[in-house]
Interface confidence: low
């Protein structure tokens, strides 16, 4: 009696199941009681000898490519052996690699967590994912896993992490890169500093006093508000960052505390107060301001 090994499918894709069947075309199963065993190269597969002429392999991988055969043994211990069948497991190369960010959009607050998610639309087997910083490609990390997605995490983002990133995926057919993703690190404003600038050392009534407010850190645009006591004098915007100024024509009523506030949508900070006093120096005929 002749024995045949049939693999279904005969050309499996990586990760897919395969059923091996040991066929005996000229013998009915009722003719004799058989035990079956399946082999790859020189190694027995699955449970070893079994009464089932089928062996289900849940997932085939590239390394499972090889020469397969089966044996059947009668109760009288006569062993039949099939011819060897070559099973080639097909690997799907990676394609359509993309890099996504969490949070989405690539905008992240300083100190927050950033995850760079590299994924492929297709690809089987062990895929190596590599993450790069900057268009020149400073290598950050590599991971090899049997998955279409892998993550690289920056637990606490710093200003220096604001860069372009890309990832590369590879599973034996050459590297496939994603597009570049820009990361913007959003920095809340620091406490602003208020400076008073007058045209002379001792400003007089009707002089123009410049109130200059500046937060040394913070993502633009920054909106500055200027206050005299608790009264709003006005606001100025700094679209590209830096400071902003507000001009005031002095009168005697302008004595008191001045402050400013910086706000870039990520939080607001108020400066320390600066006090202005009118004084009348001895022998002088006009009022002067001191701070």
């Amino acid at each position: 009696a002749e024995l045949f090994l049939i693999a279904s499918p005969s050309h499996p894709t990586e990760g897919s199941p395969v059923t091996l069947t040991c066929k005996m075309p000229f013998l009915q199963s009722s003719d004799a009681q058989f035990q079956f065993c399946f082999f790859r190269d020189t190694r027995a597969l699955g449970p070893g000898w079994s009464s089932s002429p089928k062996l289900q392999i849940a997932a085939m991988w590239k390394e499972d490519t090889g020469s397969y055969w089966c044996e059947a043994q009668t109760m009288a211990s006569k062993v039949l052996r099939s011819r060897r069948s070559q099973i080639n497991v097909h690997r799907v190369p990676v394609a359509d690699v993309s890099l996504e960010t969490q949070p989405p959009g690539g905008q992240v607050m300083e100190g927050d967590r950033l995850v760079l998610i590299c994924s492929v639309a297709m690809g089987t087997g062990d895929i190596t994912f590599l993450w790069y910083k900057g268009a020149v490609g400073l290598n950050l990390q590599s991971k090899t896993q049997r998955s279409l997605t892998a993550e690289y995490e920056i637990p606490s983002v710093r200003e220096s992490d604001a860069e372009q990133y890309y990832c590369v995926a590879e599973n034996g057919y050459g590297p496939s890169p994603s597009g570049l993703v820009s990361i913007t690190v959003r920095i809340p404003v620091s406490r602003p500093i208020l400076m008073l600038r007058a045209p002379r050392a001792q400003a007089a009534v009707e002089d123009v006093l410049e109130l200059h407010c500046e937060a040394l850190r913070g993502s633009p645009p920054i909106l500055y508000w200027f206050y005299h006591e608790d009264i709003t004098l006005g606001s100025r915007s700094a679209p590209s960052g830096g400071g902003a100024s507000f001009n005031l024509s002095l009168t005697e009523e302008h004595s008191g505390n001045y402050s400013c506030e910086a706000n870039n949508g990520l939080g607001a900070q108020r400066s320390e107060a600066v006090t202005l006093n009118f004084t009348v120096p001895t022998g002088a005929r006009s009022n002067h301001l001191t701070s």
């Epitope: 690997r91 190369p93 996504e100 998610i117 994924s119 993550e151 057919y173 050459g174």
Partner: antibody, heavy 117, light 112 residues
Amino acid sequence: QVQLVQSGAEVKKPGASVKVSCKASGYTFTRYWMHWVRQAPGQGLEWMGRIDPNSGGSKYNEKFKSRVTITADTSTSTAYMELSSLRSEDTAVYYCARVNSGAMDYWGQGTLVTVSS
Amino acid sequence: DIVMTQSPDSLAVSLGERATINCKSSQSLLYSSNQKNYLAWYQQKPGQPPKLLIYWASTRESGVPDRFSGSGSGTDFTLTISSLQAEDVAVYYCQQYSNYPTFGQGTKVEIK
């Protein structure tokens, strides 16, 4: 067996938004990307975008980028496509389609969206 | 974007005769690493969603009759229906998936 079941037909006014759902069953939702394709009456097929339900990452056709949002809810195995600022030329049948090794092997039944004042 | 161009736009064939649809891409869909072409063919009947027929340019999807075959490589591809049946009346689309998906404009197949 694999099934993609989409929400029912919608009639919308110009300027409004529409959100179409696509419920997947019969397979592991997070293992396959989901694409959205539309077809205007008597016209061909036009790719709108896709989502990887595993990561939530999406990619869009530049033509729709500012108006389309594709999301996925893994707890219910449902993908969503929202199109905003609707105009009459957005009248079409919208399909979701599962992707297996690049090709779209299973499609939803389609959702007709009519934009009319 | 990769542009896919089908020809002809429509085709009338007698029952039992061969139908041939061509598809041309604006850039090669062949991956040299695995010698596979990233191209699919779909059939769409009125009121129905498209149905996948062929992927990798020449691999028939499970359950698709063997009268449907795909061939070609690089930028030029062909879908052949060896013996047209009444149920094959439909619009056929090619689609590349080497990049973000794009479809051909479609070819309408009718019975002569």
